[in-house]
């Protein structure tokens, strides 16, 4: 039975040209996290494997940085980066947990960032 829950940064906004941290946190389960996939719509951005480390998809290498933690940093944002992002936690023995974040990239300099989720 899957008892875990994923907390995310939720809906966030950022300025064009800036950067943002996408953060998820899996709680309420003792399942072992074997891998976290970060996806944008149907595109794989990055993988963090518990044993081997990070893999950043080649097409995002210049604009995506690992971390902090299991999170992902998006840099040099463009309006095309607006959309849904998913953190997919592969765990054993529970299975897969998915969290959703919506990022809006704004042209103006008055982008109000949603409350950042901090992993303790």
């Amino acid at each position: 039975m899957m008892t875990g829950t994923i907390e995310t940064t939720g809906n966030i906004s950022a300025e064009k040209g800036g950067s943002i941290i996408l953060q998820c946190h899996l709680s309420s389960t003792t399942a072992q996290v074997t891998q976290v996939n970060w996806e944008q719509q149907d595109q794989l951005l990055a993988i963090c494997n518990a044993d081997l480390g990070w893999h950043i998809s080649p097409s995002f290498k210049d604009r995506v940085a690992p971390g902090p933690g299991l999170g992902l940093t998006l840099q040099s944002l463009t309006v095309n980066d607006t959309g849904e992002y998913f953190c997919i936690y592969h765990t054993y023995p529970d299975g897969t947990y998915t969290g959703r974040i919506f990022l809006e990239v704004l042209e103006s300099s008055v982008a109000e960032h949603g409350a950042r989720f901090q992993i303790p």
């Epitope: 993988i47 494997n49 044993d51 081997l52 480390g53 592969h90 054993y92």
Partner: antibody, heavy 117, light 107 residues
Framework: EVQLLESGGGLVQPGGSLRLSCAAS????????VSWVRQAPGKGLEWVGY????????YYADSVKGRFTISRDNSKNTLYLQMNSLRAEDTAVYYC??????????WGQGTLVTVSS | DIQMTQSPSSLSASVGDRVTITCRAS??????LNWYQQKPGKAPKLLIY???SLHTGVPSRFSGSGSGTDFTLTISSLQPEDFATYYC?????????FGQGTKVEIK
Amino acid sequence: EVQLLESGGGLVQPGGSLRLSCAASGFTFSNYGVSWVRQAPGKGLEWVGYINPSRGYTYYADSVKGRFTISRDNSKNTLYLQMNSLRAEDTAVYYCARSYGGGFDYWGQGTLVTVSS
Amino acid sequence: DIQMTQSPSSLSASVGDRVTITCRASQTIERRLNWYQQKPGKAPKLLIYDASSLHTGVPSRFSGSGSGTDFTLTISSLQPEDFATYYCQQSYIIPPTFGQGTKVEIK
């Protein structure tokens, strides 16, 4: 006591195939990722590939991608490395190693693969 | 791929000496750095993981330090059984990569 025991090495001609096995004991095999690491004679260590404990997803070094396949049978506590289209540069001692927190914490004794005509 | 460079490639030391081996990564790897010892004809053994954590059963004369790109393995008082080749390995970016090794020989 954690133990890993490789087998299946030997002499094979270029272009040939070989399957290595790694029998695990002393720990819950299905809880751990496992990697293959090789060492050419007189050279350093090179990671070959990895398989996840439960879902079975795999990663490979570019040098073996498309030629080598890692699989596992958790019911038999055994890891496999299927090596096809072997080349002279694949000659090495092949080790299986348990992955833990980024390191390879336990290793087998190794099995020698020689690719030569 | 991340390149790992060890120095020196070999060194000669005496029993009781303090020995330091360094490992440099071509880009930051935070603290995802492991150290191994290998003796001729034997499999490598994990000594240190996550830059400074001692693996089970490893004597306390071995210690590791560093973060980012620069790391150090120190043997505080070299023992006869410590003559071997030492490898560093990063586990921050796939694929995992090893240094070329440092051979510690008897002076």
